[in-house]
């Protein structure tokens, strides 16, 4: 696995332990918490990053209305089970034997159950809607400039193929970034939209996962863009399975659909 040879660190993941014990004395980096060897030339999977995090000390509307099946990560942090490739296992359980099914970004997509709960397959999240509100700025942002800058960011910083950035919408002060990636579209070596979205989420919270880099400096024609709040919606290839109780009321939501729970990252 590639890593910075000179000082043996992982440029794309600071939550690693690296040492020159790879083949031929090459630098090899392992994710904290799991000990899984990671490829430092690309993004580390969200599952391994969450595991590492848990192991560490502690007018015409152009905006998209999230689909009724959109999920938002309301459950917060948990210590996930990852498969050998670093993907989330379809079923996750906590220490008290409460289990639930998750999608490919690790967000719960069923009611919680017991150890008898079955999750037949890991359902792919194929559409991610990143909803941001930016801080008021001295200079206005031009939509096409903003679009170009965000596409550049996902291409250069997160190494996400441009074809997976489906759209950038802007209605001041709200920015929406749509990422789409079907199972059939994702080739070997392609960064997963879920991983790119997670790196972006951590960046805009001022918690960059990249080694030794300062905070993300995002500019549109030189004007800094500061993010006041972030909300991420996840859409799966197969709609989630929640009980009617959750859908008809009793949710902690902020919208007409109670599984759009608003998770404020800022």
């Amino acid at each position: 696995h590639t890593a910075a040879q000179d000082n043996c660190t992982c440029p794309t993941n600071k939550m690693t332990v690296c040492s020159p014990d790879g083949p031929g004395g090459r630098c090899q980096c392992r994710a904290l918490g799991s000990g899984v060897a990671v490829d430092c030339s690309t993004l580390t999977s969200k599952c391994l990053l969450l595991k590492a995090r848990m192991s560490a000390p502690k007018n015409a509307r152009t905006l998209v209305r999230p689909n009724e099946h959109a999920l938002v990560d309301n459950d917060g942090l948990y210590d996930p089970d990852c498969d050998p490739e670093g993907r989330f296992k379809a079923r996750q359980c906590n220490q008290t034997s409460v289990c639930w099914c998750v999608n490919s970004v690790g967000v719960r997509r069923t009611d919680k159950g017991d150890l008898s709960l079955r999750c037949d397959e890991l359902v792919r999240t194929h559409h991610i809607l990143i909803d941001l509100r930016h801080r008021p700025t001295a200079g206005a942002f031009n939509h096409s400039d903003l679009d170009a800058e965000l596409r550049r960011l996902f291409r250069e910083r997160y190494r996400l193929h441009p074809k997976f950035v489906a759209a950038v919408h802007y209605e001041q002060p709200t920015i929406q970034i749509e990422l789409r990636q079907n199972t059939s579209q994702k080739a070997a070596g392609d960064v997963d939209i879920g991983d790119a979205a997670y790196y972006f989420e951590r960046d805009v919270k001022g918690e960059s996962l990249f080694q030794g880099r300062g905070g993300l400096d995002l500019r549109v024609r030189g004007e800094p863009l500061q993010v006041e709040r972030t909300l991420i919606y996840y859409l799966d290839e197969i709609p989630p399975k929640f009980s009617m109780k959750r859908l008809t009321g009793g949710g902690s939501g902020g919208g007409s659909h109670h599984h759009h729970h608003h998770h404020h990252h800022h």
């Epitope: 200079g139 905070g215 500019r219 030189g222 500061q226």
Partner: antibody, heavy 122, light 106 residues
Framework: QVQLVQSGAEVKKPGASVKVSCKAS????????INWVRQRPGQGLEWMGW????????KYNEKFKGRVTMTVDTSTSTVYMELSSLRSEDTAVYYC???????????????WGQGTLVTVSS | EIVLTQSPATLSLSPGERATLSCSAS?????IYWYQRKPGQAPRLLIY???NLASGIPARFSGSGSGTDYTLTISSLEPEDFAVYYC?????????FGQGTKVEIK
């Protein structure tokens, strides 16, 4: 440490131009904009504009538009501010200052250069 | 343009006393920045985003406020704090500074 070093004092005649330099060190030069602020004798601080070295974007105070030009030389990590058609009221100390910003915050103007006194006199 | 008015123009206090400097904006701003300037020196950033202490600035300095009214407080004046203080807004162009408050020894 982050440092901005400006060129020395200048004496100019009315109608002439002056070009002040600001050499940056101690940080990634292209990652922050450089602002220019002046202080006339006995007056407050007056913002003139900024230039962003990564792509050359700039924003000028309308008051100085047409008279001020900011340029950058990334090879030497130096920013220049040229003020033309000088008049006596342009006599001031001119400062360059770095504005560091991330998606989380705007960290203000820090640090500032030591200042360059420009005297306009016939 | 947004006009920032600082008051008082001059504040005469003794070391150890508390200093309260005001900055009033002609229209609402989201954040205010505070700078200190001593004779013959360049300004120095004290506070960014209204209330955050800049690197290396002592904890006796603090900032607060919202909308049009902002305050810089020095809890207990040290001899090196006697200087001119400026507020600045980054809400709209042109960026503007207040005219300054001079904190002098009584």
């Amino acid at each position: 440490q982050v440092q901005l070093v400006q060129s020395g004092a200048e004496v100019k005649k009315p109608g002439a131009s002056v070009k002040v330099s600001c050499k940056a060190s101690g940080y990634t030069f292209t990652s922050s904009d450089i602002n220019w602020v002046r202080q006339r004798p006995g007056q407050g601080l007056e913002w003139m504009g900024w230039i962003y070295p990564r792509d050359g974007s700039k924003k000028y105070n309308e008051k100085f538009k047409g008279r001020v030009t900011m340029t950058v030389d990334t090879s030497t990590s130096t920013v220049y501010m040229e003020l033309s058609s000088l008049r006596s009221e342009d006599t001031a100390v001119y400062y360059c200052a770095r504005r560091f910003a991330t998606v989380v915050s705007n960290y203000g103007l820090d640090p500032w250069g030591q200042g360059t006194l420009v005297t306009v006199s016939s | 343009e947004i006009v920032l008015t600082q008051s008082p123009a001059t504040l005469s206090l003794s070391p150890g006393e508390r200093a309260t400097l005001s900055c009033s904006a002609s229209s609402s701003v989201n954040y205010i920045y505070w700078y200190q300037r001593k004779p013959g020196q360049a300004p120095r950033l004290l506070i960014y985003d209204t209330s955050n202490l800049a690197s290396g600035i002592p904890a006796r300095f603090s900032g607060s406020g919202s909308g049009t009214d902002y305050t810089l407080t020095i809890s207990s004046l040290e001899p090196e704090d006697f200087a001119v203080y400026y507020c600045q807004q980054w809400n709209s162009y042109p960026l503007t500074f207040g005219q300054g408050t001079k904190v002098e020894i009584k």
